[in-house]
């Protein structure tokens, strides 16, 4: 079939391949200090690491990309580590009328894959 | 709001930023010559190019990633160019009982963004 088996073990060594990592950031880092009130320190889950051949392939396209990158590395980029899903985060922020809570569905990664 | 305005003009010059590009590939390139019969030459649309700050940001997460990459480039990778959508492709392939047509929904990119 079109789907080769994606690899789940990292051939580059522990922590080197595509995975979820928590990055601390302040509202100032994000340029949000004028409108977000809480949390003032965010724990952002982001996708980092390399995507060696067939590691956590997102889909058939990513598998093709990995294969063609091996053949034509100057023309076809390697797959890269991006979110496969997101988890909701609630922010308290200023509004014209006071304070409001809002849920953001695409702010923080929940899982990662190579696309 | 959390959503800064994604940029649509490439600051790096024509063709340098994240875009859709057609890559020619044979069945041999893909390792599919044993089971795919047609087409024998595929025109694969893939996402290539760089993702400078806020260029075609996929979502809030990508905007945050771009910002934090500017602050902590060793810790947070830049967003990268990946498919935002796919277009279906039909392949004719061998089966135990003969020949069959199958539609693949995730084989060829239709659009790109920075995630």
């Amino acid at each position: 079939s079109a789907h080769a088996h994606p690899r789940d073990s990292c051939p580059l060594g522990p922590g080197r391949c595509c995975h979820l990592e928590t990055v601390q950031a302040t509202l100032e880092d994000l340029g949000w200090s004028d409108w977000v009130l809480s949390p003032r320190q965010l724990q952002l889950s982001m996708c980092v690491g390399e995507c060696p051949h067939l590691y956590r392939s997102a889909n058939t396209h990513a598998q093709i990309k990995a294969r063609l990158h091996g053949l034509q590395p100057d023309k076809v980029p390697a797959p890269c580590c991006v979110p496969s899903s997101y988890t909701p985060v609630v922010l308290m922020h200023r509004t014209d009328s006071g304070v409001s809570l809002q849920t953001y569905d695409d702010l923080v990664a929940r899982g990662c894959h190579c696309a | 709001s959390a959503h800064a305005h994604p940029r649509d003009s490439c600051p790096l010059g024509p063709g340098r930023c994240c875009h859709l590009e057609t890559v020619q590939a044979t069945l041999e390139d893909l390792g599919w010559s044993d089971w795919v019969l047609s087409p024998r030459q595929l025109q694969l649309s893939m996402c290539v190019g760089e993702c400078p700050h806020l260029y075609r940001s996929a979502n809030t997460h990508a905007q945050i990633k771009a910002r934090l990459h500017g602050l902590q480039p060793d810790k947070v990778p830049a967003p990268c160019c990946v498919p935002s959508s796919y277009t279906p492709v039909v392949l004719m392939h061998r089966t135990d009982s003969g020949v069959s047509l199958q539609t693949y929904d995730d084989l060829v990119a239709r659009g790109c963004h920075c995630a």
């Epitope: 009130l37 809480s38 949390p39 003032r40 320190q41 609630v90 922010l91 200023r94 | -």
Partner: antibody
Framework: QVQLQQPGAELVKPGASVKMSCKAS????EGWYIHWVKQRPGQGLE????????????NHAQKFQGKVTMTRDTSSSTAYMQLSSLTSEDSAVYYC????????????WGQGTTLTVSS | DIVMTQSPSSLSVSAGEKVTMSCRSS???????????LDWYQQKPGQPPKLLIY???NRAHGVPDRFTGSGSGTDFTLTISSVQAEDLAVYYC?????????FGGGTKLEIK
């Protein structure tokens, strides 16, 4: 509706450990922090620490260093707090509460678990 | 740690009277745009605390408008404009400006 459910009571012997639960429902568990607050009989409120269910990261008051361990199980939307080496000083009501972050008001509280440490 | 001091420790009033209670912090709780990280809670006997006021002056959902928070920096006040019998409780202030979060000792409100 949005709620945090805690067991009503725990009776534990001195020197032992206890693991209290706080089950969230009616909202996205990973979107809010869980805080733990202690209240000794007839006394005021004392903040113990927080747990971010999304990342598993925790922070607690220095006073509870070595005493408290906060964990969570996202599959069951449950936060846990384990207290070790129990003494009579640990006899109290323990509340879990949710907040938007480490620095936000606690808008929903559990009913509290009454811990009695006695031989 | 930020120390929160509440006064008085108790007070007794008749229904319909106006009540004010004070909360003082050992350092400023003021952040940007005039927001103070100071909240007020009401705890009735045998119940968990309930959020009344957050960020110094914002009433929580469902809280009657007879409850008002005010103040800035280090000095804060909770006012009940017309006390009702059901307001019998202990009132706590709490700062979340920095970790560790700390509570005041509470003000016990009794109804004559």
């Amino acid at each position: 509706q949005v709620q945090l459910q805690q067991p009503g009571a725990e009776l534990v012997k001195p020197g032992a450990s206890v693991k209290m639960s706080c089950k969230a429902s009616g909202y996205p568990f990973e979107g809010w922090y869980i805080h733990w607050v202690k209240q000794r009989p007839g006394q005021g409120l004392e903040w113990m620490g927080w747990n971010n269910p999304r990342t598993g990261l925790t922070n607690h008051a220095q006073k509870f260093q070595g005493k408290v361990t906060m964990t969570r199980d996202t599959s069951s939307s449950t936060a846990y707090m384990q207290l070790s080496s129990l003494t009579s000083e640990d006899s109290a009501v323990y509340y879990c509460a949710r907040g938007v972050g480490a620095d936000a008001a606690f808008d929903i509280w559990g009913q509290g678990t009454t811990l009695t440490v006695s031989s | 740690d930020i120390v929160m001091t509440q006064s008085p420790s108790s007070l007794s009033v008749s229904a319909g009277e106006k009540v004010t209670m004070s909360c003082r912090s050992s350092q400023s709780l003021l952040w940007k745009h005039g927001y103070n990280y100071l909240d007020w809670y009401q705890q009735k006997p045998g119940q968990p605390p309930k959020l009344l006021i957050y960020l110094d002056r914002n009433r929580a959902h469902g809280v009657p408008d007879r409850f008002t928070g005010s103040g800035s920096g280090t000095d804060f006040t909770l006012t009940i404009s017309s006390v009702q019998a059901e307001d019998l409780a202990v009132y706590y202030c709490m700062q979340s400006f920095e970790t560790p979060i700390t509570f005041g000792g509470g003000t016990k409100l009794e109804i004559k």
